[in-house]
């Protein structure tokens, strides 16, 4: 009985299609694979950013795999062929590993790259990113922002820069169709006549950096002698009611401070008959049902009630 052997895949490589971090890992079948034509050959692929402790592992029948990487660091990957036991009348046969690496040759020293990059998706409608120039760069340095997400044919450059002293320090993005719940890739590179500028790469998902508008139409309603219902409306815009969490801050007679987090647009407050003044503000944030993270909105305008009898009217601001 001759021992069954299988070769590793050929021409294993990492291909950068220019999507700012979304890379293709691809390979060719091993030679003489057609001996196992009746059998599904699989490939075990392991990959990671250099410096990461853990490998991502994929088992696939395909000849390619796509994923996002941090291009600020290098990437390493390895792959081998797997012949399942059904192909060999015995135990699984594995080839040796084929290995490859990929990195973008860095230009310039790290200090020249943009500092304090901050991106906010205002009200799930308008993306704005801002940054500070690199440390010690001259005024002739200009930064350019490029972005890509699945659905775009190619990376696009910012067309509406925010400027300070003639330098680009931010970008107002156009309407980004079908861009949430997927990785959004950004590269900010730069040019200077003086010295090379280091590029920076960023990846996030837009629904996780949403800063909503504050709630509106704050009202009071007396429910009973000792209960007041606070109500408000969801902010205008595309975010559905089910996506909000709220934080309320309530002051009674300028002393008692109550803060609470709620999931809907009402809050019932226990009060005493001695309450002479009641004020509250609300802010909103996208909740865990719609995102993994978010940014609190600004506080709403303050709504106050001063007077004796809330039962006779509903106060509306």
């Amino acid at each position: 009985d001759t021992e069954i052997k299988v070769n590793p895949p050929q021409d294993f490589e990492i291909v950068d299609p220019g999507y700012l971090g979304y890379l293709y890992l691809q390979w060719q079948p091993p030679l003489s694979l057609d001996h196992f034509k009746e059998c599904t050959v699989e490939y075990e692929l392991k990959y990671r950013n250099i410096g990461s402790e853990t490998w991502k592992t994929i088992i696939t029948k395909n000849l390619h795999y796509k994923d996002g990487f941090d291009l600020n660091k290098g990437i390493e990957a390895k792959i081998h062929t797997l012949l399942p036991w059904q192909c060999t009348n015995g135990s699984e046969v594995q080839s040796s590993w084929a290995e490859t690496t990929y990195w973008i040759s860095p230009q310039g020293i790290p200090e020249t790259k943009v500092q304090d990059m901050d991106c906010v998706y205002y009200n799930w409608q308008y993306l704005l990113c801002s940054w500070k120039p690199g440390i010690g760069v001259l005024l002739d340095t200009n930064y350019n922002l490029f972005y890509w997400y699945e659905g775009l044919d190619h990376a696009l450059q910012c067309v509406d820069y925010i400027k300070a002293d003639g330098q680009n320090i931010g970008c107002r993005f156009p309407y980004l169709e079908a861009s949430d719940y997927k990785d959004f890739y950004i590269c900010v590179n730069g040019s200077s006549e003086n010295k090379p500028i280091r590029s920076s790469y960023f990846t996030f998902q837009l629904q996780n950096i949403v800063k909503p508008l504050p709630p509106v139409y704050l009202t009071f309603t007396r429910e009973s002698s000792c209960e007041i219902k606070l109500k408000w409306s969801i902010p205008l815009g595309p975010i559905p009611a089910r996506c909000f969490d709220y934080e309320i801050e309530i002051r009674e007679d300028d002393t008692t401070l109550v803060t609470a987090t709620v999931e809907n647009e009402t809050y019932t407050l226990k009060t005493t008959n001695e309450t002479r003044q009641l004020c509250f503000v609300v802010r909103s944030k996208v909740n865990i049902y719609c995102s993994d993270d978010g940014i609190w909105s600004e506080w709403s305008d303050k709504q106050c009630w001063e007077g004796e009898d809330l039962s006779k009217k509903t106060l509306l601001r």
């Epitope: 021409d11 691809q26 001996h35």
Partner: antibody, heavy 118, light 107 residues
Framework: EVKLVESGGGLVKPGGSLKLSCAAS????????MSWVRQTPEKRLEWVAT????????YYPDSVKGRFTISRDNAKNNLYLQMSSLRSEDTALYYC???????????WGQGTSVTVSS | DIVMTQSQKFMSTSVGDRVSVTCKAS??????VAWYQQKPGQSPKALIY???YRYSGVPDRFTGSGSGTDFTLTISNVQSEDLAEFFC?????????FGGGTKLEIK
């Protein structure tokens, strides 16, 4: 429909240089290795060079190694063959071909003619 | 380098006949052999890969066989449009090498 269109051939003196191009369409270019194959005036087929889909791997026969360079621009779906130190024996019809999942060539262009003569 | 030898430069056949084109490798190439058809004035067209597997769209009149060093392309029920030259190629090792070709003539 897979289409490969070669260009850049012509008459060149011995020792001269020439750059051939191949414009590809109808398939995901970066997913396929590509080859150049030439056909001599005697109608023999000779493999000239192969490049992997991402361009990380290149292969040449000894007869052209150091003189010819295969490259690709995946953004433009173009394949290139830079030929230098040309000799009379490089005279041929040069085909661009797509490499299939092995190293056979499943699609071929129509070819571009290179004549090396003084 | 692996030499691929197609000993018959010309073969003559009639429409409806069956003809076999042979190719011999100078060393073992397993099943890593392809066959191409080149009609007059045209570029080569792929017929067979891995010695015996037809590319899609290739008529089943074309059959490949063999492994190791001896390979055969068989054309059954030859048609007039099969007038062409046929080349074998090995891809078991670089450099990739082709046979010298076999020209099929239709009587």
């Amino acid at each position: 429909e897979v289409k490969l269109v070669e260009s850049g051939g012509g008459l060149v003196k011995p020792g001269g240089s020439l750059k051939l191009s191949c414009a590809a369409s109808g398939f995901t270019f970066s997913s396929y290795g590509m080859s150049w194959v030439r056909q001599t005036p005697e109608k023999r087929l000779e493999w000239v060079a192969t490049i992997s889909g991402g361009g990380s791997y290149t292969y040449y026969p000894d007869s052209v190694k150091g003189r010819f360079t295969i490259s690709r621009d995946n953004a433009k779906n173009n394949l290139y063959l830079q030929m230098s130190s040309l000799r009379s024996e490089d005279t041929a019809l040069y085909y661009c071909a797509r490499r299939d999942l092995r190293s056979a060539m499943d699609y071929w262009g129509q070819g571009t003619s290179v004549t090396v003569s003084s | 380098d692996i030499v691929m030898t197609q000993s018959q430069k010309f073969m003559s056949t009639s429409v409806g006949d069956r003809v076999s084109v042979t190719c011999k490798a100078s060393q073992n190439v397993d099943i890593n052999v392809a066959w191409y058809q080149q009609k007059p004035g045209q570029s080569p067209k792929a017929l067979i890969y891995s010695a015996s597997y037809r590319y899609s769209g290739v008529p089943d009149r074309f059959t490949g066989s063999g492994s190791g060093t001896d390979f055969t392309l068989t054309i059954s029920n030859v048609q007039s449009e099969d007038l062409a030259e046929f080349f074998c190629q090995q891809y078991n090792n670089y450099p990739l090498t082709f046979g010298g070709g076999t020209k099929l003539e239709i009587k």
